[in-house]
């Protein structure tokens, strides 16, 4: 339904508070380097303009599209050329090219300082002095560091952030109350950002069909009692929501997400029995709850899939009638029966089925050709099962830190050209699959592990895309979305890699390491491990373990010493020499 003024329509639908928050997020995700105050000024100007349109939808410029209004506003930033370089060229373009240009300049790894958490008392004072500015600053800092963060979900995080300060700044022990809550929000936020980044990559790099296939599989697992037509409707609506958010249309996205939550709750009887609690919550919590809701129970006595998809003589007729609908039904039927499979596995099975039909339906006797198609699924199912079994055994044997180190070595040998910070970040996250998923029973391990790995490997792909250095990474990232993990798993040591020159500076450590948190100290050690492997890619596990053990002992010894800096200088030289000898550098 067309509105005379799109900006007035969204302002009225969302309300002033959400409108302002979403415009701030949108601007911060586009202009990631701009100071907070500049963004607040732009948001206030847009908000005042929106109010004039609410009062009179026929007022000047109120009929302009949101992209035109927001783009025009962003292009008023005085320092655009100095701060953003070629991004300023976007402003010479017309819509929709201008918005596409802004989207292409979003930076997944912006050169921004790490967010340092102030003392609790300082935070509480700032919160009490100006709650609104304090919360806006949170939105701004998260949005500029995570330019694809799911905007309506960021509103939910901000609500929880506010609640944490409201409660804890009144507590007897503020720090004990607040810090665990902030840690939880930080970790959940990073996970949420990475999950959304995969959705946007799926849409932008592989297209709507790829995203819809993912959504059919996931929603069919989650709502196995819902009919195919119902799942299809939800998939269409969900695709619209994510297409909008990934495209920077945050007001439309938030509005449509609210409509989708409303529809799901009004129709929960035909969707899932698990939605009742979610649907009693306020909007932001409701949408979050629905997105995370557990899988409903599978209907009893579901018939065998073979009847409709292998044994029926009308398989090719049904496929010809509407290929994507028939494949969608196959995916729906398979997924609702297999909550124990990862979404990416289900998509691989559907792709195998499609390839088989393409080949067999062209034959004179199709049935004879596709009769054994389900046999082709067996190795595809067993591969992730075996991989997860092996890696969970390794995780249980080593613990998270050493499991991460094993993955660091494995991935550095596969793709040694990738930057050390990226290898450390990605391998640490890959290693978290152990504590996240290995505790689950068999039936939940694969969906947990393989779908999580898809999210982490997408981080590698988007970071690598910014500065491509490895053809192997490019190949695994671009050939097939659902085969990324098997592609990386299949990579062996890169024999073409010329080892990095030895640089003693890389292995020089100082007393400041002693004051770091355990996590930061681990990252330092893991950075050294990656550098070691880059210098000596043929080093054995045993050699690397010996050097790392020596390194850990050296850090522990010097951090206990009276003159720490001298210890690091003298013992460090000995350690480098011993390591060189041990590794034959």
């Amino acid at each position: 339904d067309a509105h005379k003024s799109e900006v007035a329509h969204r302002f009225k639908d969302l309300g002033e508070e959400n409108f302002k928050a979403l415009v701030l997020i949108a601007f911060a995700q586009y202009l990631q380097q701009c100071p907070f105050e500049d963004h607040v000024k732009l948001v206030n100007e847009v908000t005042e303009f929106a109010k004039t349109c609410v009062a009179d939808e026929s007022a000047e410029n109120c009929d302009k599209s949101l992209h035109t209004l927001f783009g025009d506003k962003l292009c008023t930033v005085a320092t655009l050329r100095e701060t953003y370089g070629e991004m300023a060229d976007c402003c010479a373009k017309q819509e929709p090219e201008r918005n596409e240009c802004f989207l292409q300049h979003k930076d997944d790894n912006p050169n921004l300082p790490r967010l340092v958490r102030p003392e609790v008392d300082v935070m509480c004072t700032a919160f009490h002095d100006n709650e609104e500015t304090f919360l806006k600053k949170y939105l701004y800092e998260i949005a500029r560091r995570h330019p694809y963060f799911y905007a309506p979900e960021l509103l939910f995080f901000a609500k929880r952030y506010k609640a944490a300060f409201t409660e804890c700044c009144q507590a007897a022990d503020k720090a004990a109350c607040l810090l665990p809550k902030l840690d939880e929000l930080r970790d959940e936020g990073k996970a949420s950002s990475a999950k959304q980044r995969l959705k946007c990559a799926s849409l932008q790099k592989f297209g709507e069909r790829a995203f819809k296939a993912w959504a059919v599989a996931r929603l069919s697992q989650r709502f196995p009692k819902a009919e195919f037509a119902e799942v299809s409707k939800l998939v269409t609506d969900l695709t619209k929501v994510h297409t909008e958010c990934c495209h920077g249309d945050l007001l439309e996205c938030a509005d449509d997400r609210a409509d989708l939550a409303k529809y799901i709750c009004e129709n929960q009887d035909s969707i899932s029995s698990k939605l009742k609690e979610c649907c009693e919550k306020p909007l932001l919590e409701k949408s979050h709850c629905i997105a995370e809701v557990e899988n409903d129970e599978m209907p009893a006595d579901l018939p065998s899939l073979a009847a409709d998809f292998v044994e029926s003589k009308d398989v090719c007729k049904n496929y010809a009638e509407a290929k994507d609908v028939f494949l969608g039904m196959f995916l729906y039927e398979y997924a609702r029966r297999h909550p124990d499979y990862s979404v990416v596995l289900l998509l691989r099975l559907a792709k195998t089925y499609e390839t088989t039909l393409e080949k067999c339906c062209a034959a004179a006797d199709p049935h004879e050709c596709y009769a054994k198609v389900f046999d082709e699924f067996k190795p595809l199912v067993e591969e992730p099962q075996n991989l997860i079994k092996q890696n969970c055994e390794l995780f249980e044997q080593l613990g998270e830190y050493k499991f991460q180190n094993a993955l660091l070595v494995r991935y550095t040998k596969k793709v040694p050209q990738v930057s050390t910070p990226t290898l450390v970040e990605v391998s640490r996250n890959l290693g978290k699959v152990g504590s996240k998923c290995c505790k689950h029973p068999e039936a939940k391990r694969m969906p947990c592990a393989e779908d999580y790995l898809s999210v982490v490997l997408n981080q590698l792909c988007v970071l690598h895309e910014k500065t491509p250095v490895s053809d192997r990474v490019t190949k695994c990232c671009t050939e097939s979305l659902v085969n990324r993990r098997p592609c990386f798993s299949a990579l062996e040591v890169d024999e073409t890699y010329v080892p990095k020159e030895f640089n003693a500076e890389t292995f020089t450590f100082h007393a400041d390491i002693c004051t770091l948190s355990e996590k930061e100290r681990q990252i330092k050690k893991q950075t050294a491990l990656v550098e070691l492997v880059k210098h000596k890619p043929k080093a054995t596990k045993e050699q690397l373990k010996a050097v790392m053990d020596d390194f850990a002992a050296f850090v522990e010894k010097c951090c206990k010493a009276d003159d720490k800096e001298t210890c690091f200088a003298e013992e460090g030289k000995k350690l480098v020499a011993a390591s060189q000898a041990a590794l034959g550098l």
């Epitope: 398989v315 010809a320 339906c361 034959a363 004179a364 049935h367």
Partner: nanobody, 114 residues
Framework: AVQLVESGGGLVQPGGSLRLTCTAS????????MSWVRQAPGKDQEWVSA????????NYADSVKGRFTISRDNAKKMLYLEMNSLKPEDTAVYYC???????SSPGTQVTVSS
């Protein structure tokens, strides 16, 4: 939507000939194997002949081997059945189908009688 329309049937004397045509629309005809099936009054449906998408493979029921010839023109989206030396037992409604599926078109009546 998939549409298959058969034509070319009629009344013919034993030993005579007919050429059936099936005009296809609503799907990528060139990607699918096609068949002719027939149904005589009071009898089960019988598969007659099949052809692969690229015409490289042609199969026939024993009852029509040497008398019937299946062919196709992918550019025109047409399937053909050339029927020679027709016998009274060839009397039936003839349908063209995708793969070896069940008929969903009206078919064309072939009657062989003196």
């Amino acid at each position: 939507a998939v549409q298959l329309v058969e034509s070319g049937g009629g009344l013919v004397q034993p030993g005579g000939s007919l050429r059936l045509t099936c005009t296809a629309s609503g799907f990528t005809f060139r990607s699918f194997g096609m068949s002719w099936v027939r149904q005589a009054p009071g009898k089960d449906q019988e598969w007659v002949s099949a052809i692969s998408a690229d015409s490289s493979t042609k199969n026939y029921a024993d009852s029509v081997k040497g008398r019937f010839t299946i062919s196709r023109d992918n550019a025109k989206k047409m399937l053909y059945l050339e029927m020679n030396s027709l016998k009274p037992e060839d009397t039936a409604v003839y349908y063209c189908v995708i793969g070896r599926g069940s008929p969903s078109s009206p078919g064309t009546q072939v009657t062989v009688s003196s």
